[in-house]
Amino acid sequence: ARNGDHCPLGPGRCCRLHTVRASLEDLGWADWVLSPREVQVTMCIGACPSQFRAANMHAQIKTSLHRLKPDTVPAPCCVPASYNPMVLIQKTDTGVSLQTYDDLLAKDCHCI
Amino acid sequence: ARNGDHCPLGPGRCCRLHTVRASLEDLGWADWVLSPREVQVTMCIGACPSQFRAANMHAQIKTSLHRLKPDTVPAPCCVPASYNPMVLIQKTDTGVSLQTYDDLLAKDCHCI
């Protein structure tokens, strides 16, 4: 159940997709990736207040138990619900190759 | 790539499966669940230091960018990699029913 999309903390404060520009050096990829030189990394950032974009029943349980035992049970966490693929041109033993990575860029987010 | 399982923060401090005992009242289920009266909730709790149980390439990217921009990019988060099903006896309009929930109990954990 993908619960409420209304953020009670104010606009943009809750779990959502953000874009962070990163160079190959930033990512630690300079030694094996040739292209692209810069990646617009989409990632899931933000708070997960009660029932906000709850991914499933487990997320709902986590919210309930976090309310009861905040020192023991963490709040749900903002993570990718799905990914967008990306093709990298990478160095290989024999030269270079095109390679699709399915799990690089977040496509949308939920709380779990 | 499921990376290192060695926790650099000390035993039990990193992302792993924990069990939390919860009543139906704790879970907010007392009005619709009859049994079990108490649930041994398995959930993923703990820190996600660099490359510890990294779920995928996205988690590795997140680690790199968190190191560079800790105020902007959060560290990866400890979440379920898979779930164990659970059968609940629940109230219905017509009486009671058995219902299997596939996403209640964490089975194992990773960082994402």
Epitope: L34, S35, I89, L98, Q99, T100, D102 | -
Partner: antibody, heavy 118, light 107 residues
Framework: DVKLVESGEGLVKPGGSLKLSCAAS????????MSWVRQTPEKRLEWVAY????????FYADTVKGRFTISRDNARNTLYLQMSSLKSEDTAMYYC???????????WGQGTLVTVSA | SIVMTQTPKFLPVSAGDRVTMTCKAS??????VAWYQQKPGQSPKLLIY???NRYTGVPDRFTGSGSGTDFTFTISSVQVEDLAVYFC?????????FGAGTKLELK
């Protein structure tokens, strides 16, 4: 509308050369990687070569490496395939294709026929 | 390079039939498989990408599924205009490779 029009078809003797062109229109050519894909007389599809949008990275199938050269002229919106040391097994319909960044082919030209025969 | 083994080579059908063809990759390609349709005298046309995503304008009778090494392409109710050759392609890594094709023909 995206349009890819191949030209340069012909009958060539083994060992000969031929240059194919692909005129692109209806999109910003310089923003897309392009590929050549061929179809043999037995109707098998074979990827031949790939070139990035700026022409800085190029990839070839092992069967054509060292004999074929893919290139592009972004000012002219044209993709090329220079083929040399042609063999009978290079006989095929050659298609120009646009790559939308994910290594599949959403747009194809109508094809140009290359026949290598003595 | 990754070999894509497509079966069957020929598939006899009648209008309204549900038909399924398969493609097996020689190594794990995730969900990076596309399916194309080619009618006589025409260029191939993209139908499915990422194993199950229908390309723009493709009717919903065409579906794809699978991941890893085993992929399936299904036409839920064959129309006369679906008689064509269908190819799978892995778009996981270079060299990009295609299956040999499955020809749909009338019984």
């Amino acid at each position: 509308d995206v349009k890819l029009v191949e030209s340069g078809e012909g009958l060539v003797k083994p060992g000969g050369s031929l240059k194919l062109s692909c005129a692109a229109s209806g999109f910003t050519f310089s923003s897309f990687a392009m590929s050549w894909v061929r179809q043999t007389p037995e109707k098998r599809l074979e990827w031949v070569a790939y070139i990035t949008s700026g022409g800085d990275y190029i990839f070839y199938a092992d069967t054509v490496k060292g004999r074929f050269t893919i290139s592009r002229d972004n000012a002219r919106n044209t993709l090329y395939l220079q083929m040399s040391s042609l063999k009978s097994e290079d006989t095929a319909m050659y298609y120009c294709t646009r790559d939308d960044g994910y290594l599949w082919f959403a747009y194809w030209g109508q094809g140009t026929l290359v026949t290598v025969s003595a | 390079s990754i070999v894509m083994t497509q079966t069957p080579k020929f598939l006899p059908v009648s209008a309204g039939d549900r038909v399924t063809m398969t493609c097996k990759a020689s190594q794990n390609v995730g969900n990076n498989v596309a399916w194309y349709q080619q009618k006589p005298g025409q260029s191939p046309k993209l139908l499915i990408y990422y194993a199950s995503n229908r390309y723009t304008g493709v009717p919903d009778r065409f579906t794809g599924s699978g991941s890893g090494t085993d992929f399936t392409f299904t036409i839920s109710s064959v129309q006369v205009e679906d008689l064509a050759v269908y190819f799978c392609q892995q778009h996981y890594s270079s060299p990009l490779t295609f299956g040999a094709g499955t020809k749909l023909e009338l019984k």
